[in-house]
Structure formats: structure tokens, C-alpha cells
Interface confidence: low
């Protein structure tokens, strides 16, 4: 007769490992007992269990509660055992030694491989700002056994770099995604994809990109200079900008306080019926955490009865 087993048994951490050992003998042959031991190189054999045809299963104290026979029905020639709740430390070489009658003893070895699926983590890089050079957008780390694969899935143009750290029973892989920040990347997903034989499907962690920027500010409302005359109703200045984080707007008048009756509503400055007191240099100050921008306009309210030119000065600054 001969022993049937597997060269390698692979199990995911926490699952039960079936260690197969089946004696395929001639008719009339019997199995008296099956002894299981762990036999890692350089270390003495450590007994797991003894499976006796008459007295049943005896488990060594070190494996008490962790070694069982497979559920019935059982074949008397089957010396397989179940190792419950496999841990990384269980990984190694195992030997089954089968005592048969009348053929004598047989032995076979197998290797137990315990897969440790990774628990990936994604860490965003420093705050992204338009105008930076190549910048770390995010790093993704996954540790497992064997080493996991870490890749990126995104529409964003960038570069990746990976490094691996080997530990005694596992390996940690870190992949970094670098990019040159631009405002068009705002809201774009950057997904870390981790593959591993211990995972039923790839694990994905998505990070939404936020790029700080502040567009130049400009003021609309002075396109038709002739409308800025005494008595005009509904005159307004609107400050235009965009940014991430969304900017806040502040209106001031450079050459004095805002005249009474002028309404500030966020990005808009609304005027009551115009008088000459509304003349002056108005400043829209746009700011977010990234930067600040100014746009200035000079308003000169004229008497429509007079045929004089009007100076309008537009200045944007950053």
C-alpha cells in the first residue's frame, strides 16, 4: 500500500486546515494508528496527535482543543486530521506516520501554508496645492503573507513607487502615488488596489483628491462705464474667483469706509441710487486657506449732465 497526502496545504489565517493522510492499502490491510507531528527543519519533532483505531484520538497538550478528526462518516484507512483556527505560527512541515497491519509503517510529509490576508491602509499625503511640483498624493500600505500586491486605479496622471519590508512571517508593501497638483484633479478618485491569494477579491480604498488653489480675482460691473452716473439704481459690483477650499469674499473701499447704504452680499456689492459719495477705489479681497487675491476697481460716479471723461482703473493682483 501507499500513503496519499498533499505536498502543500494552503489555508487562510483563522480557517481550519485539513491535514490529509490516507492509506491506500491492499484488501485486508488495517491501520492501527496514525501519529501526527510537526517536523520543521532544525527542530525536533513535536507531537500533535495520535489517532488509534481502537482508542480514538489523543491530542498532545500543546494542541489541546485544536486538533480534531474530520466529521463522520470516516474511513478507517483515513488518518487525516483538522487543525482548527490556523495561525501564522502553524505554518511549517507536518508528518503523518501510519502503522498498518500487516504491511508495517509508512510516513509522509506535507507543508502547511497559512495565508495572512492584508488589512490595507491608505494615508493621504500633505495638503495638495496648485503650483507645487511633484507631490505625494497618497501612500497605501498592506502587510500580509505572502507579500500582497499594491497598485493604483485612477484617471489622474501620476507616478508610483513601491517598497517592501520583509518581516519574519510576513511582508509589508507600501506604494506611493505622486502627482503634480492641478485644480482639474479636484474631486478625482485615487484608488489603492490590494491583491492577495488570501482575499476572495481585491480590496480597494478610495481617496478623493483635494487640490488647494485660488484663481485670480476680477470684478464685473464696470463694463459699461456710462452706466455709473448719478441717480442710477441697481448698480452692483460682482467679484469673480474660484478656489478650493471655496473662497470667502470681503469688500472694502481703499480710500475710506464703505458708504452707508452699500450692501455687501458675499461676492456682490450693491449700491443704492448713485451719488458722488460712491466714488472711490473698491477692493474685493478673496481668500482661502491656500492664498489670497485682490481685485481693485476705481468707480467714478459722474453727473450725466456733464460731458467729461471718466477714468476707470482696473487692477488685479495676486
Amino acid at each position: 500500500g501507499e500513503l496519499e497526502t498533499s505536498d502543500v496545504v494552503t489555508v487562510v489565517l483563522g480557517q481550519d486546515a485539513k491535514l490529509p493522510c490516507f492509506y491506500r492499502g491492499d484488501s485486508g490491510e488495517q491501520v492501527g494508528q496514525v501519529a501526527w507531528a510537526r517536523v520543521d527543519a532544525g527542530e525536533g519533532a513535536q507531537e500533535l496527535a495520535l489517532l488509534h483505531s481502537k482508542y480514538g484520538l489523543h491530542v498532545s497538550p500543546a494542541y489541546e482543543g485544536r486538533v480534531e478528526q474530520p466529521p463522520p462518516p470516516r474511513n478507517p484507512l483515513d488518518g487525516s486530521v483538522l487543525l482548527r483556527n490556523a495561525v501564522q505560527a502553524d505554518e511549517g512541515e507536518y508528518e503523518c506516520r501510519v502503522s498498518t497491519f500487516p504491511a508495517g509503517s509508512f510516513q509522509a510529509r506535507l507543508r502547511l501554508r497559512v495565508l495572512v490576508p492584508p488589512l490595507p491602509s491608505l494615508n493621504p499625503g500633505p495638503a495638495l496645492e496648485e503650483g507645487q511640483g511633484l507631490t505625494l498624493a497618497a501612500s497605501c500600505t498592506a502587510e500580509g503573507s505572502p507579500a500582497p500586491s499594491v497598485t493604483w486605479d485612477t484617471e489622474v496622471k501620476g507616478t508610483t513607487s513601491s517598497r517592501s519590508f520583509k518581516h519574519s512571517r510576513s511582508a509589508a508593501v507600501t506604494s506611493e502615488f505622486h502627482l503634480v497638483p492641478s485644480r482639474s484633479m479636484n474631486g478625482q478618485p485615487l484608488t489603492c488596489v490590494v491583491s492577495h491569494p488570501g482575499l476572495l477579491q481585491d480590496q480597494r480604498i478610495t481617496h478623493i483628491l483635494h487640490v488647494s488653489f485660488l484663481a485670480e480675482a476680477s470684478v464685473r460691473g464696470l463694463e459699461d462705464q456710462n452706466l455709473w452716473h448719478i441717480g442710477r439704481e441697481g448698480a452692483m459690483l460682482k467679484c469673480l474667483s474660484e478656489g478650493q477650499p471655496p473662497p470667502s469674499y470681503n469688500w472694502t473701499r481703499l480710500d475710506g469706509p464703505l458708504p452707508s447704504g452699500v450692501r455687501v452680499d458675499g461676492d456682490t456689492l450693491g449700491f443704492p441710487p448713485l451719488t458722488t459719495e460712491h466714488s472711490g477705489i473698491y477692493v474685493c479681497h478673496v481668500s482661502n486657506e491656500f492664498s489670497s487675491r485682490d481685485s481693485q476697481v476705481t468707480v467714478d460716479v459722474l453727473d450725466p449732465q456733464e460731458d467729461s471723461g471718466k477714468q476707470v482703473d482696473l487692477v488685479s493682483a495676486s
Epitope: 470667502s248 470681503n250 486657506e289 491656500f290 492664498s291 489670497s292
Partner: antibody, heavy 116, light 107 residues
Framework: EVQLVESGGGLVQPGRSLKVSCAAS????????MAWVRQAPTKGLEWVAS????????YYRDSVKGRFTVSRDNEKSTLYLQMDSLRSEDTATYYC?????????WGQGVMVTVSS | NIVLTQSPATLSVTPGESVSLSCRAS??????IHWYQQKSNESPRLLIK???QSISGIPSRFSGSGSGTDFTLSINRVESEDFSIYYC?????????FGAGTKLELK
Amino acid sequence: EVQLVESGGGLVQPGRSLKVSCAASGFTFSNYDMAWVRQAPTKGLEWVASINPGGISTYYRDSVKGRFTVSRDNEKSTLYLQMDSLRSEDTATYYCARRQPYFDYWGQGVMVTVSS
Amino acid sequence: NIVLTQSPATLSVTPGESVSLSCRASQSISTGIHWYQQKSNESPRLLIKFASQSISGIPSRFSGSGSGTDFTLSINRVESEDFSIYYCQQRDSSLFTFGAGTKLELK
């Protein structure tokens, strides 16, 4: 009324460190970029460092990069300049200034003397 | 880095004269130049921003002009309190530079 008041100057030996502060009042500090400008005795103005409103971005002149660190505490409306590995050529009056992108308000300045 | 060159280094005038101080940038900076006055033992004071924009509280005799690379600070009828050092300044790529200054002194 906008006020910028520097403090923390003094005499320090070469290679040592010093931290100067600038307490701001009279405006919403967190809306403004801030800067440090220095002036060596009998010399002109020299920009040293600046920081954006949220404190995310900092910028330095080449000669102080790696030695000076500008920071801010928006809750305390205070600007800081940590100066390490000081050299004799860092001797100057250090001004705190509000910028956007000109320096519209300046503090009275604080004297830093680096000498053995 | 953009270099600002101020001329002349020293300007000697008598009160009542009108003067022009020059600031030249090594490359075009649109209207991104700002002017400061620094009196002896005082902090600098902003006079003009964005080449020509006046600042509240600054006497009207101070005016600025220019764009691109050539800028001028004009003082109409210099008064005794105007004898100071005048600096131009610009910002480029988040870095700031000053000119070396023009000293306005009593002739």
C-alpha cells in the same frame, strides 16, 4: 486699528537659536498672508519668510532655508519665526508684516544681534 | 529671481522741488510693484501699491506710474518730512524682493 507687535529679540551667540513673535490685532489674522522682513544695520530691506493664511505654505529666502521656520497660530493671532544655527549675518531688525502681496502694515521691529 | 534696480542711489533736493525715483525690474512684472517710505529709525510705510494705486492716509503729492519693467515714484513739491529712504518691492513665485533703495536727502 491694525497693530503688529514683535517681541523676543536680543543678543544670541552664533550657532544658537532664538524665536521671535508677532502679535497681531485689529484685523482677521486668519485671512492674511504674513511675512518677516529684516534690515541689517545701515542696510536695505530684505524679505526673510512668508506663510499663507492657513499656515499650509511657507516660503523662505535661500540664505535662511533649513535654518529658519515661520509658523502661525491663528487662534492666538500670532506669527512666529524660529531661528536656528544663527550666523553673524543674521544680525538685523526683524519686522513682521502683513502682505497681500504688498506689505501694507508693519510692526515696529525687533532687534536680533548675533555675536560671540 | 527678479532683480529690482533703483536709481539714483541718492537724490539731493531742496523742499518745493518735484522729483522722480526710478525702479527697474529685470523682467516684466506687469503692475506688480509697490513703494515704501522708511524714515530714520521707523518702520517702512506703504506709499503706493500695484504701481499706481494710492493708499489711504498717504499725502496726494505721492504718485506712482509704470508697468512692465520701468516704474516711477513721483513726489510733487517735496516737503521736509519726505526726506527718507524709498524702496520698491515685488513678489514673484511667492518670493519677495526689494530694491536697494533711493535716499532722498536735503541739498
